[in-house]
């Protein structure tokens, strides 16, 4: 079990919260292991327990504070810790400098809401969650609507190169049933990803009006 | 392109001491951690100690704990293992390794690793 290839992987939300997922081929599904979080700067140490996830990975969230507080800015490093149980010890397994602005995925986006459709179009708005305002306006987003008869992964994506809440699907087709979807991304940071993809929004294009090409 | 070089090896005796180097070029290794391992003659590769980059902080295996030390000079972007106290089964080919995790597993889960260089202790 020690031999097989390990990972570990954090994000920090950019607020209070640091995910972890740590995973280790041939290791044993009981296997008892933690997280730990030590500030360079701070006075506050955090534990998570990892829980299986898959055959052989486990994840964790840091919870630093309440969900919009700004735990931690973009000079700290934290050093993150994998600890399992052996026998009556604990064993540190991997051991990371975290730069938590270097290392961002933000929560998905909520709030998402029709703000006026019509026969061909569907104006959509949406909220960010627990974004730090250390950000100001350098985010981006992407979109992507749900076609009848089509995947989620044959849905062209929408780039939106600004800190833009809203979007106006265009060139829809009349009386039709969609889903959308959006996510985040900060600009900064060398190893930050896109949050996860919003809940989807289902909504209906309008009927197109008997007698007239809308 | 990276490139972790190891050098200090030699033969030594018993209760002598040693330094390996590793010198590591090719990119800002600022948030990297870095790991020594070693491989004695018909043996498992083992962890041996790592350090942090930025903030320093240390771990080692419990057969070299008080006895090996391990630091960095970022002025210099090299890698310490102070060896004291050496004892013939600590004879191995030590290797550098370098990555943004730091293993206590094996080495091949790191980004990047050197090619070794012999230490042999003998009684």
């Known amino acids: 079990a020690v031999n097989g290839t390990s990972q570990f992987t954090c994000f920090y939300n950019s607020r209070a919260n640091i995910s972890c997922v740590w995973s280790q081929d041939g290791a044993l599904q009981d296997t008892s292991c933690q997280v730990h979080a030590w500030p360079d700067r701070r006075r506050w140490n955090q534990t998570c327990e990892l829980l299986p996830v898959s055959q052989a990975s486990w994840a964790c969230n840091l919870i630093l504070g309440a969900p919009d507080s700004q735990k931690l800015t973009t000079v700290d490093i934290v050093t993150l810790r994998v600890l399992c149980r052996e026998g009556v010890r604990w064993r540190v397994m991997a051991i990371q400098d975290f730069k938590p602005f270097e290392n961002l995925r933000l929560m998905a986006p909520i709030s998402l809401q029709v703000v006026h459709v019509e026969t061909h179009r569907c104006n959509i708005s949406w909220e960010i969650s627990q974004a730090s305002h250390y950000f100001e306006r350098h985010l981006e987003f992407e979109a992507r609507t749900l076609s009848p008869g089509h995947t989620w992964e044959e849905a062209p994506l929408l780039t939106l190169k600004q800190k833009q809440e809203w979007i106006c699907l265009e060139t829809l087709t009349p009386d039709t049933q969609y889903e959308f979807q959006v996510r985040v991304k900060p600009l900064q940071g060398e190893f930050t990803t896109w949050s996860p993809w919003s809940q989807p929004l289902a909504f209906r294009t309008k009927p197109a009006a008997l007698g007239k090409d809308t | 392109q990276v490139q972790l070089q190891e050098s200090g090896g030699g033969l030594v005796q018993a209760g002598d001491s040693l330094r390996l180097s590793c010198v590591v070029s090719?990119?800002?290794?600022?948030?990297?951690?870095m790991g020594w391992f070693r491989q004695p003659p018909g043996k498992e590769r083992e962890f041996v100690a790592l350090?942090?980059?930025?903030?320093?902080?240390?771990h080692y295996t419990d057969s070299v704990e008080g006895r090996f030390t391990i630091s960095r000079d970022s002025a210099k972007n090299t890698v310490y293992l102070q060896m004291n106290s050496l004892k013939p089964e600590d004879t191995a080919v030590y290797t550098c390794?370098?990555?943004?995790?730091?293993?206590?597993?094996?080495?091949?889960?790191?980004?990047?690793s050197g090619q070794g260089t012999q230490v042999i202790v003998s009684a």
């Open positions: 390794a370098a990555g943004r995790v730091g293993y206590t597993t094996n080495l091949h889960s790191y980004d990047y």
């Open positions: 350090i942090t980059w930025s903030t320093g902080r240390v």
């Open positions: 090719g990119r800002d290794f600022s948030g990297y951690t």
